[in-house]
Interface confidence: medium
Amino acid sequence: AGIVIPQNPECPNTGDKNFPQNVKINLNVLNRKTNSRRASDYHNRSTSPWNLHRNEDPERYPSVIWEAKCRHLGCVNAEGKVDFHMNSVPIQQEILVLRRESQNCPHSFQLEKMLVAVGCTCVTPIVRHMG
Amino acid sequence: AGIVIPQNPECPNTGDKNFPQNVKINLNVLNRKTNSRRASDYHNRSTSPWNLHRNEDPERYPSVIWEAKCRHLGCVNAEGKVDFHMNSVPIQQEILVLRRESQNCPHSFQLEKMLVAVGCTCVTPIVRHMG
């Protein structure tokens, strides 16, 4: 899709290098309930199962983030055994969080990027042949 | 880990119901390069492969978000055929984005939650057996 130019020419596009560095944020979160059906058992039923680890930081918003760690190097086969001809690998996602700029904290935050593992998937290993 | 109390008692905890609704954000993003190894081929090498679809919105930050769509209902077996005894399912992650509050846009944004599919994993269907 082509870039839609905002109606007010003084408003730079959010993808632009001129996007304002200091903005006011309303933290009444839109879509507070994203209403997803909780896929709470995928991490156990996957052929590349994972455990969820709680990452907590009170100086960050959101303060709790769950991170996935693959249980095995290989993948679970139909017999329930770990097959090392395949690999369990984390699927990572870059997310935005808000970080308090200083401990004496007037309502001032810094946007921060975090790389989190959301779950795991089973992949065929890369086999390089010589010659 | 226990909650760390911010040093200034006037600063509510970011996980708290009293977290400020209007804050100032510095958009000089920390960790701009999260230095992830680009898992660009997992989507093809996975037993539950996926395609990545570009979701673009100039009124949002980040303006481009990539969404995963599983290629198959089943999973790819060792012979490269789709096996319907297993299911490819999307792994979803709730992320925060910034949404411009109005078209005439003084530097005012709203925090918004989005549910995005990051990749796919292969799971065993729920078949409940008794006894």
């Epitope: - | 996926w50 395609n51 209902l73 490819s88 399912v89 269907p125 729920i126």
Partner: antibody, heavy 120, light 107 residues
Framework: EVQLVESGGGLVQPGGSLKLSCAAS????????MSWVRQTPDKRLELVAI????????YYPDSVKGRFTISRDNDKNSLYLQMSSLKSEDTAMYYC?????????????WGQGTTLTVSS | DIQMTQSSSYLSVSLGGRVTITCKAN??????LAWYQQKPGNAPRLLIS???SLETGVPSRFSGSGSGKDYTLSITSLQTEDVATYYC?????????FGSGTKLEIK
Amino acid sequence: EVQLVESGGGLVQPGGSLKLSCAASGFTFSSYGMSWVRQTPDKRLELVAIINSNGGSTYYPDSVKGRFTISRDNDKNSLYLQMSSLKSEDTAMYYCVRCHYDYERVFDYWGQGTTLTVSS
Amino acid sequence: DIQMTQSSSYLSVSLGGRVTITCKANDHINNWLAWYQQKPGNAPRLLISGSTSLETGVPSRFSGSGSGKDYTLSITSLQTEDVATYYCQQYWSTPFTFGSGTKLEIK
């Protein structure tokens, strides 16, 4: 309450085309696989098409493959079935069906159906 | 394709009685079997999945059993509201086929 309401059925000549629609409500549409199942005049049930929750993957039995296309619009909570090169054996009641939990094989909620008649 | 055979097209049972509806696959389906009930003029309704697991809201007088190729749906203490056609469906192998149905009537 889960509701599935089909529309778009009618009388079509052999070789013709038709698009069925289904409006879903009462559940998080974007979280479920959806399907079309038809019931022939002799009351036999036959799976026609399945689409997964985010629309990324589909399945068709050989009887309709290449002629029917299932699609969905999660923003509109709608499911569609585009049918072309219709044959008399496609005459049936077409049900819009929600797939059970997270595996697209078992069908837990059914609409009331819309009738397709293929005849010259 | 896996064929699902419901040998009885019709069954006539007394009120309060017990009925067993059978479904046979021409290959192993490893308990990946569902049962549906269709009352006259209505759409089908899922009763059981995984050959034995009752769906929420289904009365406990319904039960499923079986393994391998052979499966049964049992209804104890038959009620008038149980008058319907019952279909089995295998979901072990595409194209996830249905049986031809067994119509239950009251004697």
